[in-house]
Interface confidence: low
């Protein structure tokens, strides 16, 4: 995938040069007023009928350097009695995110944009029962 | 949070220039082999006991320009009979993501990194009953 500018706006922009030499202001702005990164992690991961655990994915040459990836705790969902319900499945909700990866040994520092697919949490769905033909 | 440049590592880099003129290769790489963006949207949003809808958030000056934001359909969860269970709540699972925003009227194109908090899907949790003191 590539990000192509509306080249009409800057008529002399070469697509090839544009893609590889875009200037980015790396002051990170929150589009919400609150400092998002300081918010307390929610306790939904324990209270959900499809509970999950968070695993630390760490890479010093990436921003964000630490990404927490969800994994469902059980294949099934937990019912009101705290037992696993074999008619209901825990499934992972995934989200595609952008990360910045530092190009190795680049000076001045250059980055590339990467897409990652990360697990964010789990939800409970009815098992699909396939009938025999 | 504050961003301070490591101006040292590339000794001739001016802090001010560094922050605002970092080169980024905007050819977007997938860190997974598969072309992530072509994957079919999952049908979990309909099959979940805490179903959700997806709302299109579009901004032509942002990459990605389209972000799909989840909203839970109900305050409660759906039980096996398809009825709302008043002991169980549908709650939104949120994820902090990075986006690139084009600086207004910049020519050549420059971008800034923004953090956004987006809803990804919903999960079902037991209502917390607060005891009277």
């Amino acid at each position: 995938a590539a990000i192509i500018p509306q080249s009409s706006a800057c008529p002399n922009t070469e697509a090839k040069d544009f893609l590889q030499n875009v200037k980015v202001n790396l002051k990170v702005f929150n589009s919400l007023g609150a400092k998002v990164s300081s918010r307390r992690p929610s306790d939904y991961l324990n209270r959900s009928t499809s509970p999950w655990t968070l695993h630390r994915n760490e890479d010093p040459d990436r921003y964000p350097s630490v990404i927490w990836e969800a994994q469902c705790r059980h294949q099934r969902c937990v019912n009101a009695e705290g037992k696993l319900d074999h008619h209901m499945n825990s499934v992972l909700i995934q989200q595609e995110i952008l990360v910045l990866k530092r190009e190795p040994e680049s000076c001045p520092f250059t980055f590339r944009v990467e897409k990652m697919l990360v697990g964010v949490g789990c939800t409970c769905v009815a098992s699909i029962v396939r009938q025999a033909a | 949070a504050a961003i301070i440049p490591q101006s040292s590592a590339c000794p001739n880099t001016e802090a001010k220039d560094f922050l605002q003129n970092v080169k980024v290769n905007l050819k977007v790489f997938n860190s997974l082999g598969a072309k992530v963006s072509s994957r079919r949207p999952s049908d979990y949003l309909n099959r979940s006991t805490s179903p959700w809808t997806l709302h299109r958030n579009e901004d032509p000056d942002r990459y990605p320009s389209v972000i799909w934001e989840a909203q839970c359909r109900h305050q409660r969860c759906v039980n096996a009979e398809g009825k709302l269970d008043h002991h169980m709540n549908s709650v939104l699972i949120q994820q902090e993501i990075l986006v690139l925003k084009r600086e207004p009227e910049s020519c050549p194109f420059t971008f800034r990194v923004e953090k956004m908090l987006v809803g990804v899907g919903c999960t079902c949790v037991a209502s917390i009953v607060r005891q009277a003191a």
């Epitope: 350097s65 520092f109 | 301070i4 490591q6």
Partner: nanobody
Framework: EVQLVESGGGLVQPGGSLRLSCAAS????????MYWVRQAPGKGLEWVAE????????YYVDSVKGRFTISRDNAKNSLYLQMNSLRAEDTAVYYC????????????WGQGTLVTVSS
């Protein structure tokens, strides 16, 4: 949970010395460059010193070169700043910070330790 706890600040006369320490926990300390940053009264943040993951390279802002020494002990998850020949203009709250990638997005830093250089 990431924690950075600084100590060692205090009141010192011009020309004196202090050694600041920072105890780190909650992340893989040896994988990250670490930094000392300071904020003088009424001023913005100033990057002071950086040390790479293995301690092999150190960098300093010009105003402290030859006077300050940054070091680390990865076995103890600790960062240090030895400050010699202190001047009045070194008066500031000193913070240790964990590096992300460039530029540094200091999500994590401690409460700071106040260094006052005065006669």
């Amino acid at each position: 949970e990431v924690q950075l706890v600084e100590s060692g600040g205090g009141l010192v006369q011009p020309g004196g010395s202090l050694r600041l320490s920072c105890a780190a926990s909650g992340f893989t300390f040896s994988s990250y460059s670490m930094y000392w940053v300071r904020q003088a009264p009424g001023k913005g943040l100033e990057w002071v010193a950086e040390i790479r993951q293995d301690g092999s390279e150190q960098y300093y802002v010009d105003s402290v070169k030859g006077r300050f020494t940054i070091s680390r002990d990865n076995a103890k998850n600790s960062l240090y700043l030895q400050m010699n020949s202190l001047r009045a203009e070194d008066t500031a709250v000193y913070y240790c910070a964990k590096g992300e990638i460039l530029p540094l997005y200091f999500d994590y830093w401690g409460q700071g330790t106040l260094v006052t250089v005065s006669s």
